[in-house]
Interface confidence: low
């Protein structure tokens, strides 16, 4: 579209796609396909130890000298900025042997009017400005280059894009006399992709656009646009995929209705309605066409935008997401939960599960939490015996050329993993719950009682006595 072209850096066209990359010549290393763990499921620890030792012996330098850090690069095109006009940027750790690129969009809520953006600027400046960003960041979780921490994609080129546009990665409006703040989230992603083409992305086989929280929603809003951009620039063979973590929100009714005064108390629809106007937010074209003018806010909600997307997207979402509960005005303080609230929370899980039924690649544990993929212990949670890295590996396999035509899931390699048990933390691999009031860790039994769940009710569907359930949950916590 015409509007997008104006943001291309004049005189700095990316290099044309090198032909040798598309079809490697004889003797050129072709990156191998992700490891298939099927045969080693039983002894994962020893397998991972072997992988690590092999990886380290293949590196030209010792493990001690391996630098785990991603290094900051501010955008050369300084017209693509953070809210305050400082240049946006990205952190990069290259992995020269790999043709996989992981671009991660950071999360961090949003602001939707002058007042709450001013307040955000005062208290969370790094989410609106690049001027105090550290020069390096440690890659954790899916951004880690350690095979034990990241059995999924440890060898990929890692890119972390800090969130400094406060617009759920949707904006395309510069700072001006009229606009105190720039909202350029969508353009930041585009510009990062353009710059990375000159740093090796041009030879990529797969680009995985991932993100958590607002970054997860940013994935849904931008994944198709990134694919279009690469096609436009002459790189149609790069497969673009999305991984949206904790960004699949519901535009549901709040538990207690509240006025839209600040970011976290504002109902999801109200916040996005206001935001999209304030940011001049962009949504995917195909989704926009489904809603009439003024109704584009619908496209910020996963279950509405997902069916319109062309790129494959893997959705990761806690069934009882803390950010969703916050915007729904559910604040789990030190007080025991009332019956009405317990039912509201259970219903939220049910609704969320329902929205994922037609999402073939999804991982939704019945836990009360928020964000997962850049946590160091992202490998710990399982749904029906499958961990998230394993599910992502299965997804990769299902998307691999030989399976393109086939819609049937790979045997023993599931990609649709949604917990069916109906209350928070009924999955024993959930992360530890903290009392939001005291910060203390709670074991699951304590937590469920705090949530007002009658142990008899919880135990019955499991065919257990309450005492057995308590024992089982305490061991699982």
């Amino acid at each position: 579209s015409e509007g997008r072209k104006t943001w291309r850096r004049r005189g700095q066209q990316p290099p044309p796609p090198p032909r040798t990359e598309a079809a490697p010549a004889a003797g050129q290393p072709v990156e191998s396909f992700p490891l298939d763990f099927t045969a080693v499921e039983g002894n994962m620890d020893s397998f991972m130890a072997q992988v690590k030792s092999l990886a380290q012996s293949l590196y030209p330098c010792s493990a001690q000298q391996l630098n785990e850090d991603l290094r900051l690069h501010l955008l050369l095109n300084t017209s693509v900025t953070c809210n305050d006009g400082s240049p946006a940027g990205y952190y990069l750790k290259e992995s020269r042997g790999s043709r996989r690129w992981l671009l991660f969009l950071e999360g961090g809520w949003y602001c939707f009017n002058r007042e709450n953006c001013d307040s955000r600027y005062d208290t969370m400046r790094r989410l609106m400005s690049s001027r105090d960003w550290p020069r390096t960041r440690t890659g954790t979780g899916i951004l880690s280059s350690q095979p034990e921490e990241n059995p999924y994609w440890w060898n990929a080129n890692m890119v972390f894009i800090p969130y400094c546009s406060s617009d759920v990665w949707s904006g395309a409006s510069p700072k001006s006399d009229k606009n105190e703040y720039a909202f350029m989230g969508s353009l930041i992603i585009q510009e990062v992709v353009r710059e990375l083409l000159g740093k090796g992305l041009s030879g990529a086989k797969v680009l995985l656009l991932a993100g958590s929280s607002a970054g997860g929603t940013g994935v849904l809003l931008n994944v198709d646009r990134v694919a279009e951009l690469l096609e436009e620039l002459g790189y149609p063979s790069i497969q673009v995929r999305g991984l949206a973590d904790s960004g699949w929100f519901l535009d549901n009714k709040q538990y207690r209705r509240s006025d839209c005064i600040d970011t976290i108390n504002c109902a999801p629809t109200d916040a996005i309605r206001r935001g999209i106007r304030y940011w001049s937010g962009m949504v995917p074209e195909r989704c926009q066409r489904q809603f009439k003018e003024g109704e584009e806010w619908n496209c910020f909600f996963g279950y509405k935008v997902y069916p319109t997307l062309r790129c494959p997207v893997f959705v990761v979402q806690w069934l009882f997401d803390e950010a969703q509960l916050t915007v729904d005005n559910v604040h789990l303080t030190g007080q025991p939960v009332q019956e009405g609230l317990r039912l509201y929370i259970q219903n939220l899980g049910r609704e969320l599960r329902h929205t994922l039924k037609d999402v073939p690649a999804s991982f939704a544990p019945a836990c009360l939490s928020h964000e997962i993929i850049i946590r160091s212990h992202w490998t710990d949670v399982q749904v029906k015996g499958t961990s998230l890295p394993r599910a992502l590996h299965c997804w990769d396999r299902s998307l691999h050329d030989s399976h393109k035509a086939s819609k049937t899931p790979l045997k023993g390699c599931p990609v649709h993993l949604v917990d069916s048990c109906p209350w928070p933390h009924c999955n024993p691999s959930c992360p530890t719950v903290r009392d939001q009031f005291t910060g203390q860790e709670m074991n699951v039994a304590q937590f469920l009682m705090h949530m007002g769940f009658d142990m008899q009710t919880v135990a019955q569907p499991q065919g257990l006595e309450p005492s057995e359930l308590l024992g089982m949950l305490s061991n699982g916590s």
Epitope: D122, T123, R126, D132, W133, G139, T140, R375, S376
Partner: antibody, heavy 119, light 111 residues
Amino acid sequence: EVQLVESGGDLVKPGGSLKLSCAASGFTFSDYGMHWLRQAPEKGLEWVAYISSGSTTLSYANTMKGRFTISRDNAKKTLSLQMTSLRSEDTAIYYCARKNYNGGYFDVWGTGTTVTVSS
Amino acid sequence: DIVLTQSPASLVVSLGQRATISCRASKSVSESGYSYMHWYQQKPGQPPKLLIYLASNLESGVPARFSGSGSGTDFTLNIHPVEEGDATTYYCQHSRVLPPTFGSGTKLEIK
């Protein structure tokens, strides 16, 4: 030049009171959260209190809660620490320090002012 | 409160060699890719001076001989090669949550 200068340190009797001040210059004082820290003779560093840029958040070390009060005047670019019910263990060099926006580390320190509590 | 255990309490290193100081936190001080651990140098009669912030970032004006690493609970400050003027006390500090706390300090001597 970015600078913090403390004043008000003195010799005071146990149970007495004292008010310390910290004058800031060379930066936009109202943009930054500020801390007081202290160091007893031949001892390590200990955090005392914190005040956010707009004074909306105040926080104190447990042993100082109820006895010390942190405040700031952004127009005058000053930070204060009112200390009451002083004890001998409050004897220390008191530093004011600027909190970096994002990391919570102390990127600028004052030179310190000495408080001695003794009968 | 998060307790920081710094070791060793004192350290003697030959001129030009490497000095390594460790700091262990009682709870993880890392979150979402940031490690909220910082290192300071304090010379007698002076306030502390920031050397390394967020585990591995060198404060501007600090010589590249100083470097920091670590994440979670274990952090290290390295000085290499050590110079005469480095003989003083070093502290680690976390800012993961209030209250921020400091390690008890490591006194570096040069021989």
